[in-house]
Interface confidence: low
């Protein structure tokens, strides 16, 4: 039985040109995390494998940085970065847990939501 839950940063906002941290946390389970995938719609952004470490998809490597922790840092944000992001936790023996984050990219400096996850 899958008892775990994913906590995420939820709906967050950031300014165009800025950076943001996408963060998920798996709790309430003793399952072993073997891999975490970060995906945007149908695109794979990054993989953090428990054994092999971080790998950023080559098409994103200039703007995506691993961490902190199992999170993902997006840099030089553009309006095209707005939308849904998914953290997919592969665990043994539970299986897969998925968390969803919605990112809004603002033209102006009114990104008040989720400010504690934003990088100055």
């Amino acid at each position: 039985m899958m008892t775990g839950t994913i906590e995420t940063t939820g709906n967050i906002s950031a300014e165009k040109g800025g950076s943001i941290i996408l963060q998920c946390h798996l709790s309430s389970t003793t399952a072993q995390v073997t891999q975490v995938n970060w995906e945007q719609q149908d695109q794979l952004l990054a993989i953090c494998n428990a054994d092999l470490g971080w790998h950023i998809s080559p098409s994103f490597k200039d703007r995506v940085a691993p961490g902190p922790g199992l999170g993902l840092t997006l840099q030089s944000l553009t309006v095209n970065d707005a939308g849904e992001y998914f953290c997919i936790y592969h665990t043994y023996p539970d299986g897969t847990y998925t968390g969803r984050i919605f990112l809004e990219v603002l033209e102006s400096s009114v990104a008040e939501h989720g400010a504690r996850f934003q990088i100055p």
Epitope: T34, Q35, Q43, L44, I47, N49, A50, D51, L52, G53, W54, H55, I56, S57, P58, S59, K61, I88, H90, Y92, G95, T96
Partner: antibody, heavy 120, light 108 residues
Framework: QVQLVQSGAEVKKPGASVKVSCKAS????????ISWVRQAPGQGLEWMGW????????NYAQKLQGRVTMTTDTSTSTAYMELRSLRSDDTAVYYC?????????????WGQGTLVTVSS | AIQLTQSPSSLSASVGDRVTITCRAS??????LNWYQQKPGKAPKLLIY???SLQSGVPSRFSGSGSGTDFTLTISSLQPEDFATYYC??????????FGQGTRLEIK
């Protein structure tokens, strides 16, 4: 274009070691992993393990642990697979393959294969 | 390790036929399932990744579907160059990647 070029065929005696090379070109070597897959005559594909060209971390198939070592030389974009204590059932074609992160670890490019024959 | 079972092990078909090969995983692997084609004496070639995504350069007559434990590779209209052996591979358990046993597609 992406190419993986492997070393030539080898004939070895039981108990000996073999080291197969795989020279990559046409892409950023450190942005991908290299897997090794073997195929005994008339048989299916068997995954042997892989190495991250990014950080050198390895993961080996359980049945080969202790006998196989995978390494990379980033200065020459070359991956190596060494198999020790060879037995007759190690006779196979050995392939290196690039692990495509965007392909969710599908092996998107393969070497031409290296036939290793173990015979007394 | 996660086991992959392909069916059938072999099949005969004619040019123009629609062919379906299935791959069943011993546990749920989400969409971490890839399909390969291998011709005699040649290295395998990636056809489908992530269960349903067509690899660049692969003809559109190849398609993949499925999620969880049951997956399908379909060739909509067989061409002479499609006669080969097909393998599924899971990359869900990246610490123990496994292949199916293969399906040999022969000319009827």
């Amino acid at each position: 274009q992406v190419q993986l070029v492997q070393s030539g065929a080898e004939v070895k005696k039981p108990g000996a070691s073999v080291k197969v090379s795989c020279k990559a070109s046409g892409y950023t070597f450190t942005s991908y992993g290299i897997s090794w897959v073997r195929q005994a005559p008339g048989q299916g594909l068997e995954w042997m393990g892989w190495i991250s060209a990014y950080n050198g971390n390895t993961n080996y198939a359980q049945k080969l642990q202790g006998r196989v070592t995978m390494t990379t030389d980033t200065s020459t974009s070359t991956a190596y697979m060494e198999l020790r204590s060879l037995r007759s059932d190690d006779t196979a074609v050995y392939y290196c393959a690039r692990a495509g992160w965007e392909q969710q670890l599908g092996f998107d490019y393969w070497g031409q294969g290296t036939l290793v024959t173990v015979s007394s | 390790a996660i086991q992959l079972t392909q069916s059938p092990s072999s099949l005969s078909a004619s040019v123009g036929d629609r062919v379906t090969i299935t791959c069943r995983a011993s546990q749920s692997i989400s969409s971490y399932l890839n399909w390969y084609q291998q011709k005699p004496g040649k290295a395998p070639k990636l056809l489908i990744y992530a269960a349903s995504s067509l690899q660049s350069g692969v003809p559109s007559r190849f398609s993949g579907s499925g999620s969880g434990t049951d997956f399908t590779l379909t060739i909509s209209s067989l061409q002479p160059e499609d006669f080969a052996t097909y393998y599924c591979q899971q990359s869900y358990s990246t610490l123990a990647i496994t292949f199916g046993q293969g399906t040999r597609l022969e000319i009827k």
